[in-house]
Amino acid sequence: TANSVACRDGLRAQAECRNTTHLLQRQLTRTQDSLLQAETQANSCNLTVVTLQESLEKKVSQALEQQARIKELENEVTKLNQELENLRIQKETSSTVQVNS
Amino acid sequence: TANSVACRDGLRAQAECRNTTHLLQRQLTRTQDSLLQAETQANSCNLTVVTLQESLEKKVSQALEQQARIKELENEVTKLNQELENLRIQKETSSTVQVNS
């Protein structure tokens, strides 16, 4: 009887162990699925980062070029204003000379 | 004897089941660690994306402002060149008038 009781207990323990095994398998399946999703998400995000970095680099480069162009145009405006000023002075001077003569 | 053999087999099967459970548990722990790592990586990457997008938006906005400034300066240069041209013509005309008189 002791033997059959022990055997019965053993069988019950074995069935319980199998159930634990099956629970772990299902949990592992879910975790692996989540891992795959997270990895896919991380990979996709990394690609987005690369794309954004490239775009940002282009924009930084564009901003620098534009800044240089602005500087160049501002210098041009200053130079032209100077020339205009000179011409106006010359014109005024020549007008004065004309009147005096 | 048959009973003891069955019991012995049962004990062996139970030990094997426990061993399998340990293997699964270890694999589950490793997979959960990998999942945590992948999720952390994905979250960190998502923050990087947000930062990069903000930087890119600022640069795009800056580029548009600079573009507008360039346009404004180019118009200014055109206008000044026109004024210079007019002044030169006036000057030349006035010089001709002076010479003729």
């Epitope: 199998r18 159930n19 095994t21 099956h22 398998q25 299902r26 399946t29 692996q32 699925d33 | 293997l23």
Partner: antibody, heavy 116, light 108 residues
Framework: AQSLEESGGRLVKPDETLTLTCTVS????????IYWVRQAPGKGLEYIGF?????DTYYATWAKGRFTISRPSTTVDLKITSPTTGDTATYFC?????WGYGLDLWGPGTLVTISS | ELDLTQTPSSTSTAVGGTVTINCQAS??????LSWYQQKPGQPPKLLIY???KLASGVPSRFKGSGSGTQFTLTISGVQREDVATYYC??????????FGGGTEVVVK
């Protein structure tokens, strides 16, 4: 003695629904996984899916939606929806204690022929 | 998706010879691999489980080894009754489970 036996295999027309049954003897279905595997004539073995003792079912990606595994009582059924000639095969059910134990007990198989 | 590549597809040996069958998994499957023997007109029979454990009643000339992605079934001292097709079955998880393509063993 523990055993499994498949039944329900026959000649059916394409798109006709077919249900195969795996009858178990001496096996407590609540603590085993029952797998369905098929083998086309002259080809290799192909995993379809399985049912846990808890009743949870899992399928191979290609089999999802086309096959349904259920456990109405002391039998395990495999329903084949809208079969095509490519589903012609011998269908086996097999028992497993878990991933680490393999499929330790198999039924003799039942032949399904899909033809118009 | 789990893919199991079994090599060779066919092999021939003399009685008493040794046969080695390889099974390569497309991703790491730990030790969740089993080997089966199938004779014509019969269902498959489990030989090895958990990559290296011998199933009940299987002769000791059958030996399984490997883990992760590389697995091997070795039959030492091949007998005439070993003429059959051998399959590996790998489990990555409940969804990704697959059989290898099979290896036919012929005895000269």
């Amino acid at each position: 003695a523990q055993s499994l036996e498949e039944s329900g295999g026959r000649l059916v027309k394409p798109d006709e629904t077919l249900t195969l049954t795996c009858t178990v003897s001496g096996i407590d279905l609540s603590s085993y996984m029952i797998y369905w595997v098929r083998q086309a004539p002259g080809k290799g073995l192909e995993y379809i899916g399985f049912i846990y003792g808890s009743g949870d079912t899992y399928y191979a990606t290609w089999a999802k939606g086309r096959f349904t595994i259920s456990r109405p009582s002391t039998t395990v059924d495999l329903k084949i929806t809208s079969p095509t000639t490519g589903d012609t095969a011998t269908y086996f059910c097999a028992r497993s204690s878990g991933w680490g134990y393999g499929l330790d007990l198999w039924g003799p198989g039942t032949l399904v022929t899909i033809s118009s | 998706e789990l893919d199991l590549t079994q090599t060779p597809s066919s092999t021939s040996t003399a009685v008493g010879g040794t046969v080695t069958i390889n099974c390569q998994a497309s991703q790491s499957i730990n030790v969740w691999l089993s080997w089966y023997q199938q004779k014509p007109g019969q269902p498959p029979k489990l030989l090895i489980y958990q990559a290296s454990k011998l199933a009940s009643g299987v002769p000791s000339r059958f030996k399984g080894s490997g883990s992760g992605t590389q697995f091997t079934l070795t039959i030492s001292g091949v007998q005439r009754e070993d003429v059959a097709t051998y399959y590996c079955l790998g489990i990555y998880n409940d969804i990704d489970t697959a059989f290898g393509g099979g290896t036919e063993v012929v005895v000269k």
